[in-house]
């Protein structure tokens, strides 16, 4: 039941975060910058991984997509590649966990089948997880680090003059939004593993007990009796249980001195 | 790269009109203001008329009633029609366009070239 529990969760944390990292990526919130000494009106510009737009405080709003896929920054192009990296493992993630939950039956599916299908979604959204904070925290740092103020602060362009204005730009919400998703994503497929451990047959649970039948070579011993044919050995020294039963694994390959009377 | 082109300077008589127009160009993104300054012969830089992309204008207050600036957003080209232009309304117009682009760039503004408007008789 725990097991169940534990896989339905992971289940359902991995489906909110990567729904956080898909909102994440389209969000245009990424990096904000608030100009407070305008000439005119109070406008706020924001800009995501595709487009970037300003807003005033009339209402007006108005977004245009990156022109280029050339001229972007390479640390641009590694954020929406991370991003997108996670979202294709997170689904492919979801997919392959809904056919391993343990509350849905399947065919025949065994329960060693939804075990390795249950690792492998919690390996994907672990994976998951960790590009979409990869991918958010290099964007923050391209923020911090305002790596474009390298520019002159004025120049001459082509037909007039140019001149670079000195702002700050602030993480977005979507970056939160990210750090939590991806966070989300990485716990529920922490989850989804723990919860192959419980699905996954022990080792105990499936070695054959054989029970044999009192022959020529059964001893009478106090505390239950043990059968044996006579072959394998218990290196092991495990306890004989009593009723006669024991595991392939407590055969013996020599005769022991009880054996024989 | 951006391009500024304006357009429709001349010479023109006391009490006449202009229409001056900005036409931009290239990789633009985030438009937050356009606008027009001049510099007359010996003087500083000013402040003609500025409009954001949402219609919100800002005019220097010697100006207000004889200029009006407006926007082509489609076309991202800034105009201003001149009326009753006065001998002091001479100088260079230089068209302005303040672009923000994000993280691709940062905050610039840009000033055209400059149109001569010469108001004599």
């Known amino acids: 039941m725990a097991v169940t529990a534990c896989q339905g969760l992971g289940f359902v944390v991995s489906l909110i975060g990567i729904a956080g990292i898909i909102a994440a990526t389209c969000m245009d919130q990424w990096s904000t910058q608030d100009l407070y000494n305008n000439p005119v009106t109070a406008v706020f510009n924001y800009q995501g991984l595709w487009r970037s737009c300003v807003r005033e405080s009339s209402g007006f709003t108005e977004c245009r997509g990156y022109f280029t896929l050339l001229g972007l920054p390479a640390m641009l192009q590694a954020v929406r590649a991370l991003m997108i990296v996670g979202i294709v493992l997170g689904a492919i993630g979801l997919l392959v966990s809904i056919f391993a939950l343990k509350c849905i039956r399947i065919g025949s599916m065994e329960d060693s089948a939804k075990a390795n299908m249950t690792l492998t979604s919690g390996i994907m959204f672990i994976v998951s997880g960790l590009c979409a904070i990869a991918g958010v925290s290099v964007f923050a740092n391209m923020l911090v680090t305002n790596f474009w103020m390298s520019t002159a602060n004025m120049y001459t362009g082509m037909g007039g003059m140019v001149q670079t204005v000195q702002t700050r730009y602030t993480f977005g919400a979507a970056l939160f939004v990210g750090w939590v998703a991806g966070g989300l994503t990485l716990i529920g497929g922490v989850m989804m593993c723990i919860a192959c451990r419980g699905l996954a047959p022990e080792e105990t649970n499936y070695k054959a007990v054989s029970y044999h039948a009192s022959g020529h070579s059964v001893a009478y011993k106090p505390g239950g009796f043990k059968a044996s044919t006579g072959f394998g050995s218990n290196t092991k020294n495990k306890k004989i249980y009593d009723g006669g039963a024991r595991t392939e694994d407590e055969v013996q390959s020599y005769p022991s001195k009880h054996d024989y009377v | 790269q951006v391009q500024l082109v304006e357009s429709g300077g001349g010479l023109v008589q006391p009490g006449g009109s202009l229409r001056l127009s900005c036409a931009a160009s290239g990789n633009i993104l985030s438009i937050n203001y356009m606008g027009w300054y001049r510099q007359a012969p010996g003087k500083e830089r000013e402040l003609v008329a500025l409009?954001?992309?949402?219609?919100?204008?800002n005019y220097a207050e010697s100006l207000k009633g004889r200029f009006t600036i407006s926007g082509d957003n489609a076309k991202d080209t800034v105009y201003l029609q001149m009326n009753s232009l006065q001998p002091e309304d001479t100088a260079v117009y230089y068209c302005y366009f303040r672009i923000n682009f994000g993280i691709l760039g940062g905050l610039r503004d840009y000033w055209g070239q400059g149109t001569q408007v010469t108001v004599s008789s």
């Open positions: 409009i954001t992309r949402g219609g919100t204008t």
